[in-house]
């Protein structure tokens, strides 16, 4: 567990008066339809709120939306609906906020049926001013910004045209027709699939994958017989129909589609799916659905090329295509992921990995909790985490697990303690060491958020009754204070804090309800006076991540290196501040066989760390296609785990084999590829 002085809960001094002086109410004069909230830029304090009240099949005078702007983190709002000419804004497109601190915003308006095209309102000054632009098409999707240049936008039209703007939506050009899906890649590249015959649905599995690197001046066909494609980290994936039957396979490219390799993954049939669960520049977590309507599949982890995959976890819960999976990247500690498995008896259990999918284990039982009715042995059980699947099943779980990169080691989640996830009302648990150990933090379901890089945790009880109390902790959830933020309770709908968990402001959203009137209301609480002083050196202590055995020289080694962090002491009540940067000291570890995965044609027998040749492949031409060409694959049977930084130690060298292979992929070989210019 992370360091913390075990002491009696001390009350934060005079906190009621301090918070009362920093609580700001805003009542919105709106019928309670829907509300959406967007932060514009980082550390700007600018929030846009769009309220809409819309009844289908009612003339436009009745559809109402209002736009509000705050520039002080939600303490005060100004009605700026007149800046968009009191136009009704389409909520299904949301507010398209530009990347980084571009200050750009695009709102898509509702237009009458007979119009030639849609209408957008554009701002490039953090929503201080808007320009109305009539479009030459009706948008089907929200405007998508290029990650590299926020002046470049793309959108699909209702007639499946791909439209691009080079001047932040001022002028639009249709660069291709019959487009199903389009995505920005790196360097302002656009990838998109096209259909030739009937429609996207009819041509599924016969789509072509195209690329343009110059915003539509020229194109290159980089794939045929495409079912779908996806981008993850530096990898471009395509699922491709097989020649002979209705199965499809994943192909991967690391050079923007110029060359492709067939991923060493099982093929899937019509009713199955692939899903990229997580990806970075090193590797990919890929889910492959089981045949039949099982609700589970297998997680595979890739090598650095995205080609060779190791089986990571069996019976991984993932309901249907685009359905629910509990797979969660714990962003507060490197290498940690949490997900759920469906066991043979159809119960759902939580598993955690601390080494990027190398090994999975159950979550340790919290010391202050009893095993529930699902446990066969009342002394031995695990913590099971509620995530997306529980939420989709309408269990009493208001929030998914929460972690933040700058709140090192902290994970907060709803859970139950037993042999499997329970349908009983869950409690809230916290880990301060990235998921190794857990403590019950709050009784019953709550909404929660992290402020000031972990210096404050805020929670609100999940209740069907109106609420007026907020809870907060300055010691990573050990002790809690309660603050009544309003005399008149409100129907609570959500907590909002600036993304990145650096802010000290929290907004409580809800609505008041009186006779035939319900109005949106927000309360923004600034905790700056609770954390009176800036943190100093003495407020921090050294913490070794992934530490399980302090006596061991290799303690804390994960993926070839260990990291020491400076962590805020639990007893310190001070501000990390908006400019807080996580201080960490990495040190390289010696290599062991655990730092290597088995290369293509090799596997690890159970309870053995050595890679041995797969018997069924001995003496066979391998169905393996590297870069779309027949060639020799040279391997020593081992490959360094992606992102592993170990040095020295074990160096698993064995005879280098030439694996003569036959390329059975029918995927584009370079000579089949064609280019064209507009």
């Amino acid at each position: 567990s992370a360091p913390g002085e075990d002491e009696e809960c001390g009350r934060v001094r005079d906190f009621v008066a301090k918070l009362a002086n920093n609580t700001h109410q805003h009542v919105f004069d709106d019928l309670r339809g829907s509300v959406s909230l967007s932060w514009v830029g980082d550390s700007t304090g600018v929030i846009l709120v769009l309220t809409t009240f819309h009844v289908p099949l009612v003339i436009m005078t009745f559809g109402q939306s209002k736009l509000y702007r705050s520039e002080d983190y939600g303490k005060n709002f100004k009605d700026i609906t007149d800046l968009i000419n009191n136009t009704f804004i389409r909520t299904e497109f949301g507010m398209a906020i530009g990347p980084e601190n571009s200050g750009k915003v695009v709102l898509t308006a509702e237009v009458s049926g007979g119009s030639r095209g849609g209408r957008i309102f554009r701002s490039s000054d953090f929503a201080k001013n808007f320009v109305q632009t009539d479009l030459p098409f009706h948008p089907l999707t929200q405007m998508m910004y290029s990650p590299q240049n926020s002046d470049y936008l793309l959108a699909l039209s209702t007639e499946n045209g791909l439209w691009v703007s080079k001047n932040f939506g001022g002028k639009w050009e249709e660069i291709h027709k019959a487009v199903c899906l389009a995505k920005w890649g790196s360097d302002n590249t656009i990838f998109f699939t096209t259909y030739a015959n009937g429609s996207c649905k009819a041509d599924l599995g016969a789509l072509e994958l195209w690329r343009t690197s110059d915003l539509g001046k020229s194109f290159k066909t980089i794939g045929v017989k495409i079912y779908s494609f996806g981008l993850g980290g530096r990898f471009l994936f395509a699922s491709v129909m097989a020649d002979k039957d209705t199965t499809r396979r994943i192909h991967v490219s690391t050079d923007q589609g110029d060359t492709w390799s067939m991923a060493q993954l099982p093929s899937v049939g019509q009713e199955q799916f692939y899903s990229i669960l997580a990806a970075n520049d090193d590797m990919v977590f890929m889910h492959v659905d089981e045949p039949g309507d099982t609700g589970f599949g297998t997680i595979f982890t890739s090598d650095d090329r995205g080609i060779v995959y190791s089986k990571s976890l069996d019976r991984h819960l993932y309901t249907t295509t685009g359905g629910e999976t509990d797979f969660t990247n714990v962003t507060s500690l490197r290498g940690v992921y949490i997900t759920s498995v469906l066991s043979e008896d159809n119960s759902i259990q939580t598993m955690i990995t601390f080494d990027q999918g190398g090994r999975w284990t159950h979550l340790r039982k919290p010391e202050n909790s009893e095993c529930d009715a699902t446990a066969k042995n009342k002394n031995e059980c695990s913590l099971h985490i509620h995530a997306s699947y529980s939420i989709s099943q309408k269990l009493n779980v208001p929030m998914a697990p929460l972690s933040e990169p700058n709140a090192v080691g902290i994970v907060i989640a709803h859970g139950s303690v037993g042999d499997a996830i329970s349908v009983m009302v869950p409690d809230v648990y916290i880990s301060d060491d990235g998921g190794y150990s857990w403590t019950k933090m709050l009784e019953g379901p709550h909404y929660y958020t992290i402020l000031d890089s972990g210096g404050i945790i805020v929670a609100i009880e999940h209740s069907s009754r109106p609420i007026n109390v907020i809870k907060f902790s300055t010691d990573e959830g050990q002790c809690w204070q309660t603050y009544t933020f309003t005399r008149d309770p409100i129907y609570f709908t959500g907590l909002a804090s600036e993304p990145g968990a650096r802010s000290m402001n929290i907004s409580i959203w809800g609505f008041t309800e009186s006779f035939l009137t319900s109005q949106w209301v927000s309360y923004t609480i600034d905790f700056k006076d609770i954390l009176e002083r800036n943190c100093e050196e003495k407020d921090y202590t050294i913490w070794l991540a992934h530490s399980t055995d302090p006596e061991d020289y290799e303690d804390g080694c994960i993926l070839g290196y260990k990291e020491q962090f400076l962590r805020l002491r639990k007893s310190s009540v001070c501000q990390n501040g908006r400019d807080y940067v996580v201080t960490k000291q990495p040190s390289i570890c010696l290599c062991s066989l655990e730092d290597f995965l088995c290369d293509f044609g090799y596997y690890r027998p159970e309870n053995d760390s050595k890679c041995v040749e797969q018997p069924e492949l001995k003496g066979h031409d391998l169905e393996f296609c590297l870069y779309g060409r027949e060639e020799h694959l040279t391997t020593n049977g081992y490959r360094k785990i992606p992102g592993d930084k170990c040095q020295g130690g074990v160096n698993p060298v064995r005879e280098v084999k030439d694996l003569k292979k036959k390329c059975t992929s029918n995927f584009l070989s370079p000579e089949k590829q064609n280019s064209k210019s507009n």
């Epitope: 709106d30 339809g33 009612v58 069907s464 006779f515 035939l516 009137t517």
Partner: antibody
Framework: QVQLQESGPGLVKPSQTLSLTCTVS??????????WSWIRQHPGKGLEWIGY???????YYNPSLKSRVTISVDTSKNQFSLKLSSVTAADTAVYYC????????????????WGQGTTVTVSS | DIQMTQSPSSVSASVGDRVTITCRAS??????LAWYQQKPGKAPKLLIY???NLQSGVPSRFSGSGSGTDFTLTISSLQPEDFATYYC??????????FGGGTKVEIK
């Protein structure tokens, strides 16, 4: 398109409790924009508002009926219900459920969707 | 309670006639007023909301005006399908909602 359908017994004995249910189809009762009302109409007479419920469970009743009325909501079934206790012959009427769109500080948006109505007779 | 007084209680008119129905509130109700049409054996149908806004799908020969205490429903050119009873309804800031007594539009 949202539709409302009343259901319940057509005949109730005096002093008993009248129970009706309104089933909402084509939309969610949990939409925070609407108020779910009961209105009745005595034979050959005008319309009388009984009360409404908000999805959160808060209710408002006509003061003239308040002591006898209970309106409840079951969001999981997409239904809301009316109970009127200690009925007499004066409660014989056509009972309608309706969706009320509420009001702002300036405007009232009216009851835009109604059930077809169910006739309840109070008689021994 | 706010009382809604509707007049006339009945009116006889011919196809093509202009028909005006008035509704008076016992105290000011801003634009918290709606108009409904009801045919025998049927549920009421919303015609006008917020005193003057035409509900979607309602013919433009129907119009509403007024605010405060005095409101008017006008049918500019009566059609055969318009013979029905018309009700005004107010929605105040405190309960109850009340309806006017109704105006029956009959064939002359």
């Amino acid at each position: 398109q949202v539709q409302l359908q009343e259901s319940g017994p057509g005949l109730v004995k005096p002093s008993q409790t009248l129970s009706l249910t309104c089933t909402v189809s084509g939309g969610s009762i949990s939409s925070g924009t609407y108020y779910w009302s009961w209105i009745r109409q005595h034979p050959g007479k005008g319309l009388e508002w009984i009360g409404y419920i908000y999805y959160s469970g808060s209710t408002y009743y006509n003061p003239s009926l308040k002591s006898r009325v209970t309106i409840s909501v079951d969001t999981s079934k997409n239904q809301f219900s009316l109970k009127l206790s200690s009925v007499t012959a004066a409660d014989t009427a056509v009972y309608y459920c309706a969706r009320d769109r509420g009001r702002t500080e300036s405007y009232y948006y009216g009851m835009d969707v109604w059930g077809q109505g169910t006739t309840v007779t109070v008689s021994s | 309670d706010i009382q809604m007084t509707q007049s006339p209680s009945s009116v006889s008119a011919s196809v093509g006639d202009r028909v005006t129905i008035t509704c008076r509130a016992s105290q000011g109700i801003s634009s918290w007023l709606a108009w409904y049409q009801q045919k025998p054996g049927k549920a009421p149908k919303l015609l006008i909301y917020a005193a003057s806004n035409l509900q979607s799908g309602v013919p433009s020969r129907f119009s509403g005006s007024g605010s405060g205490t005095d409101f008017t429903l006008t049918i500019s050119s009566l059609q055969p399908e318009d013979f029905a009873t018309y009700y005004c309804q107010q929605a105040p800031s405190v309960p109850p909602i009340t309806f006017g007594g109704g105006t029956k539009v009959e064939i002359k």
